[in-house]
């Protein structure tokens, strides 16, 4: 995930309880990871901007058969107004770098923790 800093406002923000639950699930994934997450599957990195939740879902939805991230995929769909299908890239504007799912989850988790600490939620 790119653009961890350098933006003034994250745009619209979620309720704190929802953000907290998503963070808890990502923490659970990273702590329980033994073998390479999703067999080392690669996903598109995303820009951590206002549209990052839909972008994150659009990236992760293309990983199939990985039970470890299925709950995260379902949860992210609550943050996105519209249904997201595999191969859909309306929010994922820039597709230039692929990273492992494990790194994607770690980067997303770090960013969400930062938003939570800064009180960027409803």
């Amino acid at each position: 995930l790119t653009c961890l800093g350098g933006f003034a406002s994250p745009g619209p923000v979620p309720p704190s309880t929802a953000l907290r639950e998503l963070i808890e699930e990502l923490v659970n994934i990273t702590q329980n990871q033994k073998a390479p997450l999703c067999n080392g599957s690669m996903v598109w990195s995303i820009n951590l901007t206002a549209g990052m939740y839909c972008a994150a879902l659009e990236s992760l939805i293309n990983v199939s058969g990985c039970s470890a991230i299925e709950k995260t995929q379902r949860m992210l769909s609550g943050f996105c107004p519209h249904k997201v299908s595999a191969g859909q890239f309306s929010s994922l504007h820039v597709r230039d770098t692929k990273i492992e799912v494990a790194q994607f989850v770690k980067d997303l988790l770090l960013h969400l923790k930062k938003l939570f600490r800064e009180g960027q939620f409803n």
Epitope: P12, V13, R74, G78, P81, N122
Partner: nanobody
């Protein structure tokens, strides 16, 4: 044109239950995340609960967790909110919105249904 029609509100005693419904039309209901919000008398709009398009992921504000249950029937284009163990502080106008956890403050909503919890 998006149309959302809430129903099921009413006067109920503390500890009682109600089931709110929201009939949706004018869009492909099963393609959208849906959210319930509420507005108490003299207060601002507050988020209550959200369900994803497939209905397999739900979120609740802390104060209603364990008491309220959001669900949807995509075949009937209907969103539900089961209210249980109601408290006086749950008194509000309840609105359904075609909105996610992010977009709920500025999304279209119906005319609402009034829930009054009083003894």
């Amino acid at each position: 044109e998006v149309q959302l029609l809430e129903s099921g509100g009413g006067l109920v005693q503390p500890g009682g239950s109600l089931r709110l419904s929201c009939a949706a039309s004018g869009f492909t209901f099963s393609d959208y995340t849906m959210t319930w919000v509420r507005q108490a008398p003299g207060k601002g709009l507050e988020w209550v609960s959200t369900v994803n398009p497939d209905g397999d992921s739900t979120f609740y504000r802390d104060s209603v967790k364990g008491r309220f249950t959001i669900s949807r029937d995509n075949a009937k284009n209907t969103l539900y909110l089961q209210l249980s163990s109601l408290k006086t502080e749950d008194t509000a106008m309840y609105y359904c919105t075609k909105a996610s956890l992010i977009t709920w403050p500025q999304s279209p909503r119906g005319q609402g249904t009034l829930v009054t919890v009083s003894s």
